[in-house]
């Protein structure tokens, strides 16, 4: 996602309030959580910590030579973590889901 | 990667010449190939064809409410394909690698 061009691709905090996104209608708890976000640029040379694919390396090299032909690789979540949520099931019974997958960034990389 | 905001996230052609990126020193053939690129925006609501993760959906909703707080999800390769390359091994023998992985975009998505 977007980020200051001065910083390289990294994971930063992103507090999300379920009421803000309209999910409070079914998620009882938590009221908010840290989704994190991937922020920053994918600059040449791509560092090992952004685990670039070969395609990302190629795209970065093409961008370096022809900046108007193709954009840089993008800083995105490459590994996600679950969170635990309390929600109402279809019977209206409050139910705990320990692993609601893919809700929080674990790792960022250049893709 | 970057793309016209008017079009949604999709795979488009990106011809890459190995000489342009300095890889002609070790890749003998092909001289060029289609790496493809992922281009376009990840707009609300995220369509099924961009296979959004839950995090991408959350980020899109937060961006919708607070556009300055967080950027949109990014259109990136979600599946890569190999290409075949001819290169010189350490004995100087031209060698065919049938599956040089991760070189070409197979699918794009919003992450």
């Amino acid at each position: 996602s977007t980020g200051a061009a001065s910083s390289h691709c990294q994971k930063t905090s992103l507090r999300v309030n379920f009421e803000d996104i309209g999910w409070d209608s079914w998620i009882i708890a938590p009221k908010e959580y840290d989704a994190y976000e991937c922020k920053g640029g994918c600059f040449f040379p791509l560092a090992d910590d952004v685990t670039p694919t070969k395609h990302a390396i190629v795209q970065t090299l093409v961008h370096l030579k022809f900046p108007t032909k193709v954009g840089k690789a993008c800083c995105v979540p490459t590994k996600l973590s679950p969170i635990s949520i309390l929600y109402k099931d279809d019977m209206g019974v409050p139910t705990l889901k320990y692993h609601y997958e893919g809700m929080s960034v674990a790792e960022c990389g250049c893709r | 990667s970057t793309g016209a905001a008017s079009s949604h996230c999709q795979k488009t052609s990106l011809r890459v010449n190995f000489e342009d990126i300095g890889w002609d020193s070790w890749i003998i053939a092909p001289k060029e190939y289609d790496a493809y690129e992922c281009k376009g925006g990840c707009f609300f609501p995220l369509a099924d064809d961009v296979t959004p993760t839950k995090h991408a959906i959350v980020q899109t909703l937060v961006h919708l409410k607070f556009p300055t707080k967080v950027g949109k999800a990014c259109c990136v390769p979600t599946k890569l394909s190999p290409i075949s390359i001819l290169y010189k091994d350490d004995m100087g023998v031209p060698t065919l690698k049938y599956h040089y992985e991760g070189m070409s975009v197979a699918e794009c998505g919003c992450r």
């Epitope: - | 060029e32 075949s84 001819l86 004995m91 023998v93 031209p94 060698t95 065919l96």
Partner: antibody, heavy 118, light 111 residues
Framework: QVQLVQSGAEVKKPGASVKVSCKAS????????MHWVRQAPGQGLEWMGE????????NYNEKFKSRVTMTVDKSISTAYMELSRLRSDDTAVYYC???????????WGQGTLVTVSS | EIVLTQSPATLSLSPGERATLSCRAS??????????MNWFQQKPGQAPRFLIY???NQGSGIPARFSGSGSGTDFTLTISSLQPEDTAVYFC?????????FGGGTKVEIK
């Protein structure tokens, strides 16, 4: 450096068999396919087949399939080509050659002349 | 099997002249963006020498005056400035499929 040294010239009678050897040095023997190519006097090149020294797998030219056997002895880095039921038109120079995995013949032996005559 | 037809059968030129040798395949030799065409030089009483591979790449130690071009079914070996030591028979070979096949050869003579 890479070297392929072949066995000496042979004279055989029609119906007999011949076994030509090719001793390899200067590289890891099991790394590349070994090809056999023959050339009749004043004629062009004819591919006979190839063997993978690592597993012993072979690909033969259909023309020779019933008469040719390619083998290797990894312990002495040597490839062999045996041709049976010889005819006078088998008179040729037989070459071994190291093949890249895409089929190009990169290094060649010096050749072995096999003469079939009654 | 793939049939390779070389022309002319004999080429007689003066030193310094440009030699153009042709090889036509009965079907395309292209696969994976690679042309599976090789050229060999054979001098009298000697084993063939690996000259050009993958249509346009020089083998180790081959003088720059030798170049290859072409794709699909039509290939050319060019000797830019003939030298007396270039007197030889030149064979094309396809390595796309088994059986590997050779052309009938072109004999190059120096006047």
């Amino acid at each position: 450096q890479v070297q392929l040294v072949q066995s000496g010239a042979e004279v055989k009678k029609p119906g007999a068999s011949v076994k030509v050897s090719c001793k390899a040095s200067g590289y890891t023997f099991t790394r590349y396919w070994m090809h056999w190519v023959r050339q009749a006097p004043g004629q062009g090149l004819e591919w006979m087949g190839e063997i993978n020294p690592s597993q012993g797998g072979t690909n033969y030219n259909e023309k020779f399939k019933s008469r040719v056997t390619m083998t290797v002895d990894k312990s002495i880095s040597t490839a062999y080509m045996e041709l049976s039921r010889l005819r006078s038109d088998d008179t040729a120079v037989y070459y071994c050659a190291i093949g890249a995995n895409y089929g190009g013949l990169v290094y060649w032996g010096q050749g072995t002349l096999v003469t079939v005559s009654s | 099997e793939i049939v390779l037809t070389q022309s002319p059968a004999t080429l007689s030129l003066s030193p310094g002249e440009r030699a153009t040798l042709s090889c036509r395949a009965s079907e395309s030799l292209d696969n994976y963006g690679i042309s599976f065409m090789n050229w060999f030089q054979q001098k009298p009483g000697q084993a063939p020498r690996f000259l050009i591979y993958a249509a346009s790449n020089q083998g180790s130690g081959i003088p720059a005056r030798f170049s290859g071009s072409g794709s699909g079914t039509d290939f050319t070996l060019t000797i830019s400035s003939l030298q007396p030591e270039d007197t030889a028979v030149y064979f094309c070979q396809q390595s796309k499929e088994v059986p590997r096949t050779f052309g009938g050869g072109t004999k190059v003579e120096i006047k």
